[in-house]
């Protein structure tokens, strides 16, 4: 069921071992194996990149784009197209494209009429024809320095890291990013700014659905959720090379709820999709789809329910804009590639790898406990003859429904390091001549320390304990000594500004809160990082605050029982901005308040003066009581006036009161 976590992998095995007629996970026996490219090939275009960013720099003279291209084998060919839309009938501003490659590449560049400057390494990049653009030699810098080098020339609009691209389309003047500066972050969606096609086609797998008669074939395409959940249309081109009458086929398209499909097929076939779909020939006619399972196993079940006897192609892709499927099966025999790795263990044999993955580690009271549930072992058809630590004299107890192996940190061959206590689980299985081994760990919490670091630049070089409103602050969480087997994650962070300022949520549920908090790529050591920008809309501005973050250490593999949570604090000083009235960022808050309050006073005095004149020029008999003082004309004045003496702060909300 492709469920990612071990208990779920087990759930599938349990389902296959307990074939009750009512199991919805009625395990579909269909052993997906790679299909040769002559039987089926899927290529795609996507905006998803391994690392990237898109920012807006509307007032920059130069539009800067940076591409880091990794080619596993050189030399490679690359087609790079730059597209610009005329703005107000003129070509856009000048463009600097920085091209960083790791091996030789033959570049076919198309940038018609675009005022382009190209920075690249001339020893690695060869043009198929003269580029006809201004070129600059790119220094041999590491990635971070290349970004700095590019940023010195102008604000970076986009940057992306691509692995083995075959073609790239870069759209200029399209940046829709919410960021004001570009910092590479893992797993990004570049939106309309960049689309690319990987050189390697997607892995196509196929299988025979056991127990289904006939020649109906299923083509299953599963599009995985992307990193921006806006509505998307995926164009699916299906080209099946067989005579129209020879084919009985179903196309199953599954994706996140926000994906709709535009189908361009050269054959009539049954269509089964999530979301909505339309056909290239009638693009305006949308047809409602279904809520399909989002697991491979569930989709195979759907194909089986639709009476398909062959899954001619099964493909999982990142969120793509165009997918092309070429297949030549036509309900004939499915041929898979020779001797692929077996993904599903044959029935009635024990899978040692899965068995070892079922061992749960618990750490408490200076002792390590391993638990292995017998029910799961039985479902895997395994017979265990022994479970011990590295020291074979430390044997597990049989506690009825489970085996339990427990030892203090001081015995059974435990290895105690600064950060961890490690040992080895050794399992003897009847069907295997050699014992199975698995490393097991507990964290040495007494020796671990967690630190918060505040920095004033995205390079995280110089630590500080001071933040300035309106200035970006960068935070990094570190654990020392480092623990390679565990992942440090940031669960939540808030800034406590005391009674006047209240609490500002920065991160909640591992997600950024507000439009001026950004989760950044971890440090090379894996330390979580984020940035935030704080604005104060009213006075007084607090002088200090406490940054408080809850972090979790999670095992990179294995049981989640060992998760450890800690809250880390850091006291911060807050410096009030320059009070001289105007800065490059516009009016600072006290100046705004001064002007606003001044306007209010002038308004009030004028009102009083007018009232005085008015009341003294009317006959006494006609005077009326004053019902209300006229409100100041400026809504800012009145709203600011209400909040004098209390502080409002947000992580960069755009609705300024001034």
């Amino acid at each position: 069921m492709d469920r990612g976590t071990l208990p779920l992998a087990v759930a599938l095995l349990l389902a296959s071992c307990s074939l009750s007629p009512t199991s919805l996970a009625e395990t579909v026996h269909c052993d997906l194996q790679p299909v040769g490219p002559e039987r089926g090939e899927v290529t795609y275009t996507t905006s998803q990149v391994s690392k990237g960013c898109v920012a807006q720099a509307p007032n920059a003279i130069l539009e800067v784009h940076v591409l880091f291209l990794e080619f596993p084998t050189g030399p490679s060919q690359l087609e790079l197209t730059l597209q610009a839309s005329k703005q107000n009938g003129t070509w856009p501003r000048e463009v600097l494209l920085v091209l960083s490659v790791n091996s030789s590449v033959f570049l076919h560049l198309q940038a018609l009429g675009i005022p382009l400057h190209l920075a690249y390494n001339s020893s690695l990049v060869t043009f198929q024809e003269p580029p006809g653009v201004n070129t600059t030699e790119l220094p041999s810098f590491p990635k971070t320095q290349i970004l700095e080098w590019a940023a010195e020339r102008g604000p970076i609009t986009s940057a992306a890291e691509l692995n083995d691209p075959q073609s790239i389309l870069l759209r200029l003047g399209q940046a829709q990013g919410s960021l004001s500066f570009c910092m590479l972050e893992a797993s990004q969606d570049m939106g309309r700014t960049l689309e690319w096609r990987p050189r390697t086609p997607a892995l196509v797998r196929g299988c025979h659905l056991e127990g289904v008669a006939g020649h109906k074939e299923a083509h299953i395409l599963r599009v995985l959720p992307g990193h921006s959940a806006g509505p998307r249309t995926v164009t699916v081109k299906v080209e099946l090379s067989c005579a129209p009458g020879d084919l009985d086929a179903v196309l199953i398209l599954q994706g996140p709820p926000y994906v709709s499909w535009l189908i361009d097929a050269n054959h009539n076939m049954q269509i089964w999709t999530t979301g909505e779909y339309s056909f290239k020939i009638f693009p305006e006619k949308n047809i409602r789809g279904f809520k399909l399972p989002d697991t491979p196993q569930g989709l195979l079940g759907e194909a089986r329910m639709l009476n398909a006897s062959i899954v001619a192609s099964f493909v999982e892709l990142p969120l793509a804009s165009i997918v092309s499927l070429h297949a030549s099966s036509c309900g004939g025999r499915l041929q898979t590639s020779p001797a692929p790795i077996q993904t599903t263990p044959p029935k009635d044999t024990c899978s040692p790898e899965l068995l070892m993955s079922l061992i749960q580690t618990k750490c408490a009271d200076d002792a390590m406990t391993l638990v292995l549930k017998k029910e799961l072992v039985a479902h895997l058809k395994c017979t265990i003859t022994g479970l011990t630590f590295w020291d074979p004299s430390c044997e597990a107890e049989d506690r009825g429904d489970k085996f339990v192996l427990r030892s203090a940190y001081s015995s059974c061959g435990m290895q105690v390091s600064a950060s961890m206590i490690s040992n080895e689980a050794v399992v003897n299985i009847l069907s295997s001549s050699s014992p199975q081994r698995k490393k097991v760990h507990c964290l040495n919490m007494d020796s671990l320390s967690f630190q918060l670091g505040l920095y004033l630049s995205p390079h995280f070089l110089q630590a500080s304990n001071t933040i300035e409103p309106g200035q970006q602050s960068f935070v990094q969480v570190r654990v020392s000594p480092s623990v390679s087997e565990f992942l440090l994650q940031l669960d939540s962070c808030h800034l406590d500004l005391g009674p006047e300022g209240g609490t500002v949520e920065l991160i909640q549920g591992r997600a950024a809160k507000g439009n001026c908090v950004s989760l950044l790529s971890p440090s090379p050591e894996g330390d979580p990082r984020f940035s935030f920008l704080l604005h104060f809309y009213t006075v007084p501005i607090p002088k200090t605050g406490t940054l408080s973050c809850t972090v979790a250490l999670r095992p990179k593999t294995g049981s989640q029982d060992q998760e450890v949570h800690r809250t880390v604090f850091m006291r911060l000083n807050i410096i009030s901005p320059d009070l001289s009235g105007c800065t490059s960022k516009g009016l600072v808050l006290p100046a705004v308040l001064g002007i606003t309050f001044g306007a209010f006073l002038i308004g009030a005095l004028l009102t009083a003066a007018l009232w005085y004149i008015y009341s003294h020029t009317r006959s006494p008999s006609k005077r009326e009581p004053v019902v209300a003082v006229a409100a100041p004309a400026s809504s800012e004045s009145s709203s600011t006036n209400h909040s004098i003496g209390s502080t409002q702060s947000t992580p960069c909300s755009t609705s300024s009161m001034a």
């Epitope: 069921m1 469920r3 208990p7 779920l8 759930a11 009512t22 199991s23 919805l24 996970a25 089964w272 409602r288 279904f290 809520k291 399909l292 399972p293 989002d294 697991t295 569930g298 079940g301 759907e302 329910m305 639709l306 009476n307």
Partner: antibody
Amino acid sequence: QEQLVESGGGVVQPGRSLRLSCTASGFTFSNYGIHWVRQAPGKGLEWVTVISYDGSKKYYADSVKGRFTISRDNSKNTLYLQMNSLRAEDTAVYYCARAFSTMVRGVDHWGQGTLVTVSS
Amino acid sequence: DIQMTQSPSSLSASVGDRVTITCQASQDIYKSLNWYQQRPGKAPNLLIYDASNLETGVPSRFSGSGSGTDFTFTISSLQPEDFARYFCQQYDNLPLTFGGGTRVEIK
């Protein structure tokens, strides 16, 4: 507008039979699996039975197995529930409900229900 | 059968409140979980499917999360029309099973 309308409910004596119908409109009936779910007065929901989109697969709750039979006529866009040997504990509002797809997965559209009272 | 334990069984809240209901499955059901709203005398109405996907036409104040055995349903800001009974339902395995329901009442 997707719609399911149940009919055939009423008062019946224990041990007797009753047949419920469910008529679908506004969607392609033959593409979907359909469930019967019941709710005893003031109680929670209890799944009863399901039939796959083409009628080839049928599943029942243990409490009704052997007594109830689900069937469908795709040409008439109609689902049936034949209830035999009725018991007092079968008293409930019976809803027919559309599955997510061909598969017997979740339920996204429900009828308004028909009340079955089993009483002597 | 998979047991679904829903809590609380009832709660009182005011308009504008944030309301959270939890549902626990007796075994791992991945994300095969729906949340329904049922008003008195009416049929249930699907709000959330696959644990976290908002059904078309359902207001965004409703949300769901969770995977495996623990699931949460949230109404971010309770509206007058939200006072009703809410059910979770698993569809990982037959028989389909429902939580006992949570009645959301006006405080």
